[in-house]
Interface confidence: medium
């Protein structure tokens, strides 16, 4: 029987800068029941606080609700593992909520083949930002990537759309069925997961771009 091994805070994520969750990996348990507690303080403070919510994020997590989340302050946090034989501490992790935002995927991806009379045909797609993200406040700049591939192809073709919520693609293989997905990323944060695939059939008379 031994004191617990050193835990590790391995991930912190926020869906929208208003709340966030951190997760830790336990170390070895030393063969005894082990209790874990996460403590934190904010930049410029020395007063330590305990995790406000160990439930919402699931096992080995700490969730910070709206009233505990400050956007402009760095959080300094640590996990303490304790059993009857002693304690061990994780390394401290510094968390700035601005940097850990991982939004939900964009919504309402629609894809259409456009065949204007006077120009070459193209694939046109548009989407909406995730609902949890409020772009009107100016706190967020969301960047978008699109990827697409013929249904049976192995490789994706990826395009960067910047801040646009619509995009055109000219060079496509006629007669092929394409999968299209979009994802988003705040300027300082993480890419979202890809949206569910939208399928589009390219007509056989689609003229390839020269």
């Amino acid at each position: 029987q031994l004191p617990p091994g050193k835990p590790e805070i391995f991930k912190c994520r926020s869906p929208n800068k208003e709340t966030f969750t951190c997760w830790w990996r336990p170390g070895t348990d030393g063969g005894l029941p082990t209790n874990y507690s996460l403590t934190y303080h904010r930049e410029g403070e020395t007063l330590m606080h305990e995790c406000p919510d160990y439930i919402t994020g699931g096992p080995n997590s700490c969730h910070f609700g709206k009233q505990y989340t400050s956007m402009w302050r760095t959080y300094v946090m640590m996990v303490n593992a304790t059993n009857q034989m002693g304690s061990s501490f994780s390394d401290e992790l510094y968390v700035d909520v601005t940097y850990i935002v991982q939004p939900d995927p964009p919504l309402e991806l629609t894809v259409e083949v456009k065949q204007p009379e006077d120009r070459k045909p193209y694939l046109w797609m548009k989407w909406s930002p995730p609902t949890l993200i409020d772009l009107k406040t100016g706190w967020f700049t969301l960047l978008y990537e699109i990827r697409l591939k013929p249904e049976k192809a192995a490789e994706w073709e990826t395009h960067f759309a910047g801040q646009q919520t619509e995009f055109k693609i000219l060079s496509l293989h006629p007669g092929q069925k394409y999968l299209v997905q979009v994802r988003c990323k705040p300027d300082h944060g993480y890419w979202s997961a890809w949206s569910p695939a939208t399928f589009i059939q390219i007509p056989s008379d689609f003229i390839m771009n020269d």
Epitope: I9, F10, K11, C12, E43, T46, V76, F89, D91, E92, L93, Y94, V95, D96, Y99, I100, H188, G189, Y190
Partner: antibody, heavy 120, light 113 residues
Framework: EVQLLESGGGLVQPGGTLRLSCAAS????????MSWVRQAPGKGLEWVSS????????YYADSVKGRFTISRDNSKNTLFLLMNSLRAEDTAAYYC?????????????WGQGTLVTVSS | DIVMTQSPDSLTVSLGARTTINCQSS????????????LAWYQQKPGLPPKLLIY???TRESGVPDRFSGSGSGTDFTLTISSLQAEDVAIYYC?????????FGQGTKLEIN
């Protein structure tokens, strides 16, 4: 106002011992990691050692491991560096540096330095 | 150990000019847990201790003029002075605090012509 005042430097022969001190004021000393960084004359900066709030957490550069010991006395707001088996290549200005938090990163305040000269 | 390499070693620039100093780490210092780059920039003037300018690769220390900015991620970082002033003559160092031993770049000496 944060102040860090190093002392204890001087001339010492190779193989000798010195104990550097750093008196801290203007902040809650016990809440922050502290480090020693040195600079040989005309050269760049070299991290030497750090100590976290939990005094058992100490870290050393390979070049000083086994010869230097960092410690702190939170009741006296003082950081120490005990330097044994000194070599000519240890000659440098030794700076005491405060980290932002209780473990180590970005040294936000530095002392003026104390000069250690190892020579026969 | 993580090796930090700065370029150039020295730089002579006109007053008011935009100035950039580069720093490359031998391995990534971006931590996936918090999306932070564990990199700092310091300024050292002759006869004085270093002064922290930038931490987390891009966060300006309080009191540092806003002509100083940091950028980059992973292994490649840049310190930019948007309009060089006479008081910016100094040696500039980058430092990684991702892993011990914490290591510094060799320094970039900035002078005015």
């Amino acid at each position: 106002e944060v102040q860090l005042l190093e002392s204890g430097g001087g001339l010492v022969q190779p193989g000798g011992t010195l104990r550097l001190s750093c008196a801290a004021s203007g902040f809650t000393f016990s809440a922050y990691a502290m480090s020693w960084v040195r600079q040989a004359p005309g050269k760049g900066l070299e991290w030497v050692s750090s100590i976290n709030v939990r005094a058992g957490d100490t870290y050393y550069a390979d070049s000083v491991k086994g010869r230097f010991t960092i410690s702190r006395d939170n009741s006296k707001n003082t950081l120490f560096l005990l330097m044994n088996s000194l070599r000519a290549e240890d000659t440098a200005a030794y700076y005491c540096a405060k980290a932002r938090y209780s473990s180590n990163w970005g040294f936000d305040f530095w002392g003026q330095g104390t000069l250690v000269t190892v020579s026969s | 150990d993580i090796v930090m390499t700065q370029s150039p070693d020295s730089l002579t620039v006109s007053l008011g000019a935009r100035t950039t100093i580069n720093c490359q780490s031998s391995q990534t210092i971006l931590h996936s847990s918090n999306n932070h780059n564990y990199l700092a920039w310091y300024q050292q003037k002759p006869g004085l201790p270093p002064k922290l300018l930038i931490y987390w690769s891009s966060t300006r220390e309080s009191g540092v003029p806003d002509r100083f900015s940091g950028s980059g991620s992973g292994t490649d970082f840049t310190l930019t002075i948007s309009s060089l002033q006479a008081e910016d003559v100094a040696i500039y160092y980058c430092q990684q605090y991702s892993n011990t031993p914490y290591t510094f770049g060799q320094g970039t000496k900035l002078e005015i012509n």
